[in-house]
Interface confidence: medium
């Protein structure tokens, strides 16, 4: 049970997670205009990764996209290279995991199926959050080196006479929604793997004395791995192989609270 | 790199009326907003009036029903129709231009001009 909330609670927060990393990759708040020391007050622009907008007092807005890639960032492109390559993944990682819920039953889909899928979409979370965590924090980067250069350039021109003042930019708002996206598609993909390691059936450390068991505790049928799992009709919970005919790397057996050797 | 250049300053009476003009030029892919400042002898500058790429205006009260500020987008000009002047109107006037020279990030600038002088005297 607490393997199956693990796994649920899992994929939901890295669905909201990977719902973030999206809305803030198309949000255009990446970077405001820092308004301190602003001579014209009537306009306040703002960027994201793939347009520039300006928002009159009035409430109008109006947007621009970047249609070349002169005079953008090289640091944009890895930033938007990162973002899409965590949303990519994330939803990957979200199609495997739906297949991967305990609560969801597909077929005869075993057990240890089910875990490494859940291992899986755990891993492709974990990239996916963490993409998106370098790649708002390269944005980041890149803002504060831009705020203290736009600071030191601020007061330039001739005779002392202030000719241009460099618009500051600061934070916007989808840098933290990407923080905190990635933040909970990393801890989703943590626990979709903590779920993973109950879901695994362990396999035994003893394996070689069960073939050395007493005859009495032991019934020989023939059925093989799906009688050995429970699929089969075998309903007293004791252990059943197929007659010793695969090499010990073949079979493998599992433990229950019913076994004895 | 981008200039503005203001024009229409001079001596005026009180109560005469005056029209200053503060052309952009150079590598501008867009003016957003204009404005108007001005520093008065001994003082420090002082906001006039502002105008946006659509037509919104606004002003400073001690200029308010007797300046009126405009621009020609097509042109890249600011215009200041300056009526009722008064002598505590004297000041040199600075035109301010939040532009966007080139597209990309971070390359908004707020550019000024080098200032023309108003005297208002009898």
């Known amino acids: 049970m607490a393997v199956t909330a693990c796994q649920g609670l899992g994929f939901v927060v890295s669905l909201i997670g990977i719902a973030g990393i999206i809305a803030a990759t198309c949000m255009d708040q990446w970077s405001t205009q820092d308004l301190y020391n602003n001579p014209v007050t009537a306009v306040f622009n703002y960027q994201g990764l793939w347009r520039s907008c300006v928002r009159e007092s009035s409430g109008f807005t109006e947007c621009r996209g970047y249609f070349t890639l002169l005079g953008l960032p090289a640091m944009l492109q890895a930033v938007r290279a990162l973002m899409i390559v965590g949303i990519v993944l994330g939803a990957i990682g979200l199609l495997v995991s739906i297949f991967a819920l305990k609560c969801i039953r597909i077929g005869s889909m075993e057990d240890s199926a089910k875990a490494n899928m859940t291992l899986t979409s755990g891993i492709m979370f974990i990239v996916s959050g963490l993409c998106a965590i370098a790649g708002v924090s390269v944005f980041a980067n890149m803002l504060v080196t831009n705020f203290w250069m736009s600071t030191a350039n601020m007061y330039t021109g001739m005779g002392g006479m202030v000719q241009t003042v460099q618009t500051r930019y600061t934070f916007g708002a989808a840098l933290f929604v990407g923080w905190v996206a990635g933040g909970l598609t990393l801890i989703g993909g943590v626990m979709m793997c903590i779920a993973c390691r109950g879901l695994a059936p362990e396999e035994t450390n003893y394996k070689a004395v069960s073939y050395h068991a007493s005859g009495h505790s032991v019934a020989y049928k023939p059925g093989g791995f799906k009688a050995s799992t429970g699929f089969g009709s075998n309903t007293k919970n004791k252990k059943i192989y197929d007659g010793g005919a695969r090499t010990e790397d073949e079979v493998q057996s599992y433990p229950s609270k019913h076994d004895y050797v | 790199e981008v200039q503005l250049v203001e024009s229409g300053g001079g001596l005026v009476q009180p109560g005469g009326s005056l029209r200053l003009s503060c052309a952009a030029s150079?590598?501008?892919?867009?003016?957003?907003?204009m404005a108007w400042y001005r520093q008065a002898p001994g003082k420090g500058r002082e906001y006039v009036s502002e105008i946006t790429s659509t037509g919104n205006t606004d002003y400073a009260d001690s200029v308010k029903g007797r300046f009126t500020i405009s621009r020609d987008n097509s042109k890249n000009t600011l215009y200041l129709q300056m009526n009722s002047l008064r002598a505590e109107d004297t000041a040199v006037y600075y035109c301010?231009?939040?532009?966007?020279?080139?597209?990309?990030?971070?390359?908004?600038?707020?550019?000024w001009g080098q200032g023309t002088l108003v005297t208002v005297s009898s």
């Open positions: 301010a231009a939040f532009i966007i020279p080139s597209v990309g990030m971070f390359t908004s600038r707020t550019y």
């Open positions: 150079g590598s501008i892919y867009r003016i957003n907003a």
